[in-house]
């Protein structure tokens, strides 16, 4: 399930095998003490905050071409807002975004705190070059977090770590289908800490989820279910504070 | 190459019961689902509903929830379809088709199909 | 259930000709249409799969067309060895479901 890759290398089209200009940033920088790339909060970047501090503002971790650096768009978790506060990239030079939907800025939750268990509407759908942006923090001796794609009553894609299963931590993905779950796949290395911080990237591709964590590449999950336009809601839950939940096409 | 193997056709006599495999090889049998259909003759097909042989789950077209039940027999990569209460109703062709992952999705590969008569 | 109403239900040509067979939907079930073609005493074979897409192995003289609820399905330049029954089966929904059928016969 997983790759041997770095995201920096699948998104900026070395060693990907159906390179699409992704932006280049995603996945190659340091994670800092916090989690987050480049620093622990306050100030991974110059202006910013933890999420939720700045309504309107870009995450932490932001960079060229990822949510809020579309010019007047809101950030990730404004639906619909102002366009990006201070500390989001400034927007020159940016790729604009191709495919189904218009280059329009991240779409979702509002900014600050939300209850748990979360959905977020993907009306559409979801289609490639989709870029689904989950921020949060996870609470103190959490037992599991669950990101669940779902079709109907189907779930396309259950991102599920967990954190304490059979005194292990894993993260299990999967598909259930007309109520019946199929084959496990499992993935050992877990970027998740009770207590910190935590940004979760789902980039819809052809083929499959990419998922990446803290913007380090984590794990990639072919589709089972083939009709992405019918993939209609995120449900997200578990041992988490939820700070936003948005989707930007890149 | 997916090969879809059934078994032989069946003469049965009404409100008996019979019960049709189909024997998989070539691919993952798990992995797909197996689908059953039924041409009665002369006229279209009909879908009965599938097996998800990972786990045994199973759906059904809800016409036939109350005569098709499927069962699998992951050791011999075998699906089975038992027909009850039998009526001339049921005397029909019946394939089984290998599926997508996805229940909804086209069949690629059929049986070769199975002919069950119900007579006195 | 989703209903499909396929047209005609016979048609004979000539070889060489043009064979357009229709499948309508009850409800939009989007581009999942798929075209089957069976001959007599074998299993139905698959053409053509969700999204128009022909399959492997198929000749390029059969296509299809169409999304929501109005499908069409093209044989350009008919030949003898196409005579057999034609099915749409709409993979949208639950329980899956086929047309009626087209029988196609040469002159």
């Known amino acids: 399930m997983a790759d041997n890759f770095s995201l920096h290398d699948a998104l900026s089209g070395s060693g990907n095998p159906n390179p699409q200009g992704w932006p280049g940033a995603w996945g190659n920088q340091p994670a800092g003490a916090g989690g987050y790339p480049g620093a622990s909060y306050p100030g991974a970047y110059p202006g910013q905050a933890p999420p939720g501090a700045y309504p309107g503002q870009a995450p932490p971790g932001a960079y060229p071409g990822a949510p809020g650096a579309y010019p007047g768009a809101p950030a990730p978790g404004v639906y619909p807002g102002p366009p990006s506060g201070p500390g989001a990239y400034p927007s020159s030079g940016q790729p604009s975004a191709t495919g189904a939907y218009p280059a329009t800025g991240p779409y979702g939750a509002p900014a600050g705190p939300l209850i748990v268990p979360y959905n977020l509407p993907l009306p559409g759908g979801v289609v490639p070059r989709m870029l689904i942006t989950i921020l949060g923090t996870v609470k103190p001796n959490a037992n599991r977090i669950a990101l669940d794609f779902q079709r109907g009553n189907d779930v396309a894609f259950h991102f599920n770590p967990r954190f304490n299963e059979n005194n292990r931590r894993v993260i299990v993905c999967n598909t259930k289908l007309d109520n019946n779950w199929g084959r496990e796949e499992r993935q050992s290395v877990f970027p998740f800490e009770s207590g910190k911080p935590f940004k979760i990237q789902v980039l819809v591709e052809p083929d499959h989820f990419k998922v990446a964590v803290n913007d380090a590449h984590l794990l990639q999950y072919n589709h089972r279910v083939k009709k992405l336009n019918e993939i209609s809601k995120l449900g997200i839950s578990g041992d988490i504070d939820l700070t936003s939940a948005s989707y930007t096409m890149i | 190459e997916v090969q879809l193997q059934q078994s032989g056709p069946e003469l049965v006599k009404p409100g008996a019961s019979v019960k049709i495999s189909c024997k998989a090889s070539g691919n993952t049998f798990t992995d797909h689902n197996m689908h059953w259909v039924k041409q009665s003759h002369g006229k279209s097909l009909e879908w009965i509903g599938y097996i998800y042989p990972y786990n045994g789950g199973t759906g059904y077209n809800q016409k036939f929830k109350s005569k098709a039940t499927l069962t699998v027999d992951n050791s011999s990569s075998t699906v089975y379809m038992e027909l009850r209460s039998l009526t001339s109703e049921d005397s029909a062709v019946y394939y089984c088709a290998r599926g997508e992952y996805d229940y909804l999705a086209w069949f690629a590969y059929w049986g070769q199909g199975t002919l069950v008569t119900v007579s006195a | 259930e989703i209903v499909l109403t396929q047209s005609p239900a016979s048609l004979s040509v000539t070889t060489g000709e043009k064979v357009t067979i229709r499948c309508i939907t009850s409800i939009d079930i989007d581009d999942d249409m798929n075209w089957y073609q069976q001959k007599p005493g074998e299993p139905p074979k698959l053409l053509i799969s969700?999204?128009?897409t022909l399959r492997p192995g198929v000749p390029s003289r059969f296509s299809s067309s169409g999304y929501g609820t109005d499908f069409v399905f093209t044989i350009e330049n008919t030949l003898s060895e196409d005579v057999a029954d034609y099915y749409c089966?709409?993979?949208?929904?639950?329980?899956?479901?086929f047309g009626a059928g087209t029988k196609l016969e040469l002159k």
């Open positions: 969700e999204g128009n």
């Open positions: 089966l709409q993979s949208d929904n639950k329980p899956l479901t």
